[in-house]
């Protein structure tokens, strides 16, 4: 097809040789077309113009991407020739950086429903350059963490060395959707929730006397649980006495909840106190019985083959510990009457 009618956009990707980083291209079809298309439109359905030159399709993956070889050969279908480039709905993901990604990328709808649709396409001229050493040494990472429940910020890597006053107007996207209220080089998050994670894209325009182009950077943001500030708590046993039958086997379970820690070295053990003596008991291995995003429950059992009179005089103590501190719960055995 003839690409001379495609709208054109120039983009610059300056990648750091020190870190892994990704890049994305959006299929930025002209606004009316896009409204029926990739769900990246800024119009609500009621605002869509009545007479659209391109009727599009609601199938989010109904876009074809091509690369234009520099030698003038025919357009190449991205999916067939470039394994390090993946199409996800209307977005093209570049998984690895490199100057070999430079080139012209064209997207257009797969379904052509009217003669007007032939020109419904976008040509993106991508220039890829490694970051020079002269660039800012402490630029923001392309992988940024936000601590759940606290205040945080997401910085645009290509602008993080500039003060807010110097910074040009920035366009931000999150998971391909425009964040229309964000215009500075930093997004401030008052309270971090898990839905703040995702792929953020920041764009700003740079110009010289000849032309202007969009400088783009991609930031992978993840939300992480902060290390616990609490020592573990023992969920079971709750009572400090336990009724037992003499001569019968007995299992006492200790279940303790440990808050999340990146470096996790939980301790859970049983020991016995008998008058002035105390000793650790050799018991089966501890096992994790529950793991959530914020905590983990570990269980360790003490097994008595048969309860003796001597056991009634002892205290069985469950001891648990993390990097913050320790907790104990003791159990005194009491003979069942009747």
């Amino acid at each position: 097809f003839n690409i001379s009618g495609c709208s054109t956009k120039k983009l610059l990707w300056t990648y750091s040789t020190r870190s892994e980083e990704e890049f994305v291209l959006f299929c930025d079809l002209p606004e009316p077309q896009k409204s029926h298309f990739c769900h990246r439109n800024r119009l609500s359905p009621k605002q869509v113009p009545e007479h659209l030159p391109f009727m599009g399709s609601n199938d989010l993956s109904d876009v074809q991407w091509y690369q234009q070889p520099s030698n003038g050969d025919p357009l190449e279908d991205i999916r067939k020739s470039y394994p390090h480039i993946i199409q996800d709905k209307c977005t093209l993901h570049f998984l690895t950086p490199g100057v070999n990604n430079s080139g012209s990328y064209i997207c257009r709808p797969k379904m052509i429903k009217s003669p007007y649709d032939v020109a419904c396409c976008v040509k993106m001229i991508l220039e890829v350059k490694p970051q020079t050493n002269a660039s800012c040494e402490y630029s923001a990472s392309h992988k940024q963490d936000l601590l759940l429940g606290s205040t945080g910020s997401i910085s645009c890597p290509s602008l993080s060395c500039q003060s807010d006053a110097q910074s040009p107007a920035v366009t931000w996207y999150k998971n391909g959707k425009l964040l229309s209220v964000e215009r500075s080089n930093r997004i401030v998050v008052d309270e971090v929730y898990d839905y703040h994670q995702g792929t953020y894209v920041c764009d700003y325009t740079q110009s010289d006397t000849v032309s202007s182009w969009t400088v783009r950077a991609v930031v992978q943001v993840r939300t992480i649980v902060g290390d616990t500030k609490l020592k573990p708590d023992i969920l079971d046993p709750v009572e400090d006495t336990l009724e037992v039958e003499l001569g019968k086997p007995l299992t006492i379970s200790c279940k303790a909840r440990f808050g999340f820690e990146r470096v996790f070295n939980p301790v859970i053990k049983w020991y016995i106190k008998d008058s002035d003596l105390e000793w650790e008991v050799s018991v089966p291995e501890a096992k994790s019985i529950k793991s959530t995003l914020k905590d983990e429950i570990i269980e360790r059992n003490i097994i008595l083959e048969k309860v003796t009179q001597r056991d009634l005089r002892r205290k069985f103590v469950c001891f648990v510990q993390n990097s913050i501190g320790n907790t104990t719960q003791s159990v005194q055995l009491k003979e069942k009457r009747g």
Epitope: Q197, G198, V225, K255, K290, S291, T292, L293, E299
Partner: antibody, heavy 115, light 111 residues
Framework: SLEESGGRLVTPGTPLTLTCTVS????????ISWVRQAPGKGLEWIGH??????AYYASWAKGRFTISRTSSTTVDLKMTSLTTEDTATYFC????????????WGQGTLVTVSS | AAVLTQTPSPVSAVVGGTVSISCQSN????????LSWYQQKPGQPPKFLIY???TLASGVPSRFKGSGSGTQFTLTISDVQCDDAATYYC???????????FGGGTEVVVK
């Protein structure tokens, strides 16, 4: 987003591995659950892979099902000794807090076990 | 093993009316509130409605209300709409993950 793959028609006794591929989700800070639904029946929680990559299972699923994080974007569900009772749509979903609190779901992949 | 018993299906509701679905557990859920509710329509994955027994998930209308703690929980839909016709599931999390389970589901029919 999450996408399940690998569902197909198999004969009883055949092992099968399903894959949940995530995008825009980091498995270092997100846990993934597997849930299944037999045709016309209710939902069944199979188990989950936590943020450290450890697996936890419903009591009925222990032994025959294995959940493992196979890469930074994939979580597998391996099933052995399949019977006709295992015919179902298998969903993967992101855990939001506790493990049956699932806020993002894939569309599911159908596994049919038939002789 | 844990068992979650839901109101038997189907439950009828009238547009503009109120409908309640109960979910009973044979043992306490984790933290007494680790119970979620889901809505499912034919051919679709479940939709997350309520978590921690009573907190509404993002984007869920305030017509949906969850209540209860420990072993007894209720989902109430007020000002019922035609679009609320679906099957609703409760899901419980327990002190041991091996007990985690869904309820059997309750179909809500809107007239």
């Amino acid at each position: 987003s999450l996408e399940e793959s690998g569902g197909r028609l198999v004969t009883p006794g055949t092992p099968l591995t399903l894959t949940c591929t995530v995008s825009g989700i980091d498995l270092i800070s997100n846990a993934i659950s597997w849930v299944r639904q037999a045709p016309g029946k209710g939902l069944e929680w199979i188990g989950h892979s936590d943020i450290r990559g450890s697996a936890y299972y419903a009591s009925w699923a222990k032994g025959r099902f294995t959940i493992s994080r196979t890469s930074s974007t994939t979580v597998d569900l391996k099933m052995t000794s399949l019977t006709t009772e295992d015919t179902a749509t298998y969903f993967c979903a992101r855990i939001a807090d506790v493990n049956t609190q699932l806020d993002l779901w894939g569309q599911g992949t159908l596994v049919t076990v038939s002789s | 093993a844990a068992v979650l018993t839901q109101t038997p299906s189907p439950v009828s509701a009238v547009v503009g009316g109120t409908v309640s679905i109960s979910c009973q557990s044979n043992k306490n859920v984790y933290d007494n509130n680790a119970l979620s509710w889901y809505q499912q329509k034919p051919g679709q994955p479940p939709k997350f409605l309520i978590y921690r027994a009573s907190t509404l998930a993002s984007g869920v209308p305030s017509r949906f209300k969850g209540s209860g703690s420990g072993t007894q929980f209720t989902l109430t839909i007020s000002d019922v709409q035609c679009d609320d016709a679906a099957t609703y599931y409760c899901a419980g999390d327990y002190i041991s993950d091996s007990d985690n389970t869904f309820g059997g589901g309750t179909e809500v029919v809107v007239k």
